[in-house]
Interface confidence: low
């Protein structure tokens, strides 16, 4: 338009995509009236009349913006709705009288981008590569103008490097006037890259100013060769016999070699390789002292074929060997006296305790345990416990039982239980002495033993209580070669009318067994209400 | 949530070193930078220098090299500050603060220069 | 080194009303990549301080809409569009265009 350069620059209004642009007519009353205009757009230095407006009425030209402009503003505003990338263009305003008059608009045009997406190279990196590799993609889509992108790695910009940063963008229109913009981020990484954390971001202005759009961070695989091969344990410090127990090969190098595990022969001193699990981890479960030795790993790079050997590693597994104690079976007589001798072997130094098997008391800490004037209750169970101190858990146990000679010993002597006639009674007996006794009842009835310990019996018996065996009671009676005792059940019938529910006796029902060295009669359980002492 | 917890407070004598830490916790300790700067008793802002414990890689302000050494251990998401020479100028308060944009702060750690 | 200027030294504003803070940059902040790098941060007393606005224009994260950032390549303005008693602190601009990174001498902004 001649004379066009002169005018002073337009006026710019900015809108989004999709928004309505508000074009004002800035021509003054002494510039041109504005009952009387003609709206023109302009393109490519091509004027086309798009919008006249006469006495104040509009009306919209046949053509591209026939269905979206209208007047606004008493006739001053011209409104143009759903604004897309193609409206960026000059629209002015021409005032017809008293002498034709223009302004100019510049409408710009924006559309935020969507959110970048940014792909990583799959393949990887290597690290030798000669020039620069590609590292990502970054997409970022429909946003107008061309958003800038800036590449991040470690929250740092990334600024173009010869032969080391290359950053390559390109961009294409969409059809709905909208750009696409996709940028290449190459880069020769180093091995310390491997960690690093690359993002892209975009650029973009909108009507309210500067805004732009992260995106996610991503890592890119980085290949570099293997320098070193060590062996890790699992778990980490003293180890005992019983533990799974993982040796796994590792390497510094993406990816790593292909590992190989092998174990010193102590005899040929030659490395035998070991068995692996899928993932290339030597199990040991559960660990044995035979494991124990010298280890070390092969990484074989399979591109290269160069191997490469760790520092051997020595791995010892703990143990504490049988506990062997001596005598192995004791036999005394009252009144003697007994060196009991534990021993064991171990990787680590041992302590010893004795400890009594019934009781739990410790006796003696130390491996020799000296009893003296024996008595018969010193008969039974006694526990060599050999253990590691520095090793929780690592320990092993003999029990040895010692046995004195003795005629039987009962339990207790006599015991009153509370029966119903015609009910079946579970009457038990214990006694003990050495050698074992046997046990017999003074009536008929399913009787039957078990040995206790090698020094206990219990019979237990099975009977109808009728008048004649409540006249007579029961007697059980034990011997073995160096005597005979006896033990009395008196039965007595339970007299509802004279043990009511409320009446506060304790000679309820007592269980006929007793700890094997109790001389005491056995205790007796309180009841309220006194039942048999068990039920056929 | 990202924080920054740095050591308590070190009267040192002029001569000496001080070594301040600053622990990181509720990000990924080497992807971001950390920078150290200091303020001086009623003064502003003064930048040291930045260390990415990723790499190890730092930058320091001219006017501290060779005094201050910027160093982490990874193991422990820790960054640490050693100045050497101290001179009571230095009595400030030392912060460090994360990222290239400084987007977190530590609580500061006073340290005093006296005789 | 880029010598920041920040001016006023201290400003008294009544609550509700705007806060604006200037800063001058010896050198043009504004990047080859197309971006400002000038940050504003927010110090209260005994606190460290607190970033508010990074890229001269963009609000950190959590940091109230009453506080906007703008500004050319060397002139910039942090405005507080409503001052609340909260906002009582010393106000900072940082340049992060060039080594070594300075700060401006501060603003202390008080309430009338």
């Known amino acids: 338009v001649p004379g066009e350069a002169e005018q002073p620059a337009p006026e710019l209004v900015e809108v989004e995509v999709g928004s309505t642009a508000l074009l004002k007519c800035g021509l003054s009353q002494s510039q041109g009236n504005l009952s009387h205009v003609d709206w023109f757009s302009v393109h490519k230095e091509k004027r086309t009349l798009i919008f006249r407006v006469r006495q104040g009425q509009g009306q919209s030209e046949p053509g591209e913006y026939e269905q979206r402009l209208s007047l606004q503003d008493r006739g001053a505003t011209l409104a143009l709705t759903q604004v897309t990338p193609q409206d960026e263009r000059i629209f002015l305003c021409q005032g017809k009288r008293p002498r034709s008059q223009e302004y100019r608009i510049q409408l710009r045009v924006y559309k935020a981008p969507e959110e970048p997406n940014i792909q990583v190279n799959p393949l990887g990196i290597p690290v030798n590569s000669k020039e620069p590799e590609e590292v990502a993609t970054c997409v970022g889509r429909n946003g107008y103008p061309i958003p800038q992108v800036i590449w991040y790695k470690n929250g740092r910009p990334l600024k173009e490097e010869k032969n080391r940063v290359h950053i390559q963008s390109s961009q294409t229109v969409e059809s709905s006037g909208l750009y696409t913009l996709q940028s290449i981020l190459k880069a020769q990484l180093v091995k310390e890259d491997k960690d690093a954390q690359f993002y892209c971001e975009l650029n973009y202005r909108l009507p309210s100013g500067n805004h732009m759009k992260e995106s996610r961070e991503v890592t890119v695989p980085v290949f570099y060769p293997t320098e070193k091969v060590w062996l890790e344990v699992e778990p980490v410090g003293m180890l005992k016999e019983g533990d799974r127990v993982e040796i796994r090969c590792l390497a510094d190098g993406n990816p790593p070699p292909h590992f190989s595990i092998s174990k010193q022969n102590p005899s040929t001193r030659e490395a035998e390789e070991e068995t692996t699990n899928d993932n290339g981890v030597l199990v040991l479960e559960p660990a044995r002292k035979e494991h124990s030795g010298r280890y070390e790993c092969q990484g074989l790079d399979l591109d290269t074929m160069i191997s490469l050997l760790s520092e051997p590693q020595e791995l010892l597994v703990n143990y504490v060997s049988d506990v062997r104690v001596s005598p192995a079976a004791p036999e005394r007589q009252e009144g003697s006296s007994l060196t009991l001798t534990c021993e064991a072997e171990s990787s680590q130094d041992l302590e010893f305790q004795w400890l009594r098997e019934e009781t739990g008391q410790v006796l003696e800490r130390g491996p020799v345990l000296q009893l003296h004037d024996l008595k018969r209750e010193a008969g039974g169970g006694y526990r060599c416990v050999a253990s590691v101190p520095s090793i929780p858990g690592l320990n092993r146990t003999q029990l040895v039982n010692v046995a004195i000679f003795g005629p039987p010993w009962m339990a207790f002597k006599e015991r009153k239980v509370w029966v119903k006639e015609n009910m079946v009674l579970n009457l038990s007996c214990e006694a003990s002495g050495h050698p074992r006794p046997t046990i017999s009842w003074n009536v008929n009835g399913t009787a039957s033993e078990q040995d206790q310990d090698p020094q206990r019996v219990l019979s237990t018996l099975n009977v109808l209580v009728t008048p004649e065996l409540l006249e007579t009671g029961v007697e059980c009676t034990a011997s073995n070669d160096l005597g005979k005792n006896t033990s009395i059940l008196f039965l007595e019938l339970v007299n509802l009318t004279t043990l009511t529910p409320d009446s506060n006796t304790t000679t309820g029902l007592s269980t006929s067994t007793a700890s094997p060295h109790t001389r005491a009669n056995s205790t007796s359980t309180e009841r309220k209400l006194p039942e048999p002492e068990s039920r056929g | 949530q990202v924080q920054l917890v740095q050591s308590g407070s070190e009267l040192k004598k002029p001569g000496a070193s001080v070594k301040v830490s600053c622990k990181a916790s509720?990000?990924?300790?080497?992807?971001?930078?950390i920078n150290w700067v200091r303020q001086a008793p009623g003064q502003g802002l003064e930048w040291m220098g930045w260390i990415f414990p990723g790499d190890g890689s730092t930058d320091y302000n001219e006017k501290f090299k060779g005094r201050a050494v910027l160093s982490t251990d990874t193991s422990v998401s820790t960054a640490y500050l050693q100045i050497s020479s101290l001179k009571a100028e230095d009595t400030a308060v030392y912060y460090c603060?994360?990222?290239?944009?400084?987007?977190?702060w530590g609580q500061g750690t006073t340290v005093t220069v006296s005789s | 080194d880029i010598v920041i200027t920040q001016s006023p030294l201290s400003l008294a504003v009544s609550l509700g009303e705007r806060a604006t803070i200037n800063c001058r940059s010896s050198?043009?902040?504004?990047?080859?990549?197309?971006?400002?790098?000038l940050s504003w941060f927010q110090q209260k007393p005994g606190q460290p301080p607190q970033l508010l606005i990074y890229?001269?224009?963009t609000r950190a994260s959590g940091v109230p809409d009453r506080f906007s950032g703008s500004g050319s390549g060397t002139d910039f303005t942090l405005t507080i569009s409503s001052l609340q008693a909260e906002d009582v602190a010393v106000y900072y601009c940082q340049q992060l265009v060039e080594y070594p990174y300075t700060f401006g001498g501060g603003t202390k902004v008080e309430i009338k």
């Open positions: 050198k043009s902040l504004l990047y080859k990549d197309g971006k400002t790098y």
């Open positions: 603060a994360r990222y290239h944009f400084f987007d977190n």
């Open positions: 890229l001269m224009s």
């Open positions: 509720g990000y990924t300790f080497t992807s971001y930078d």
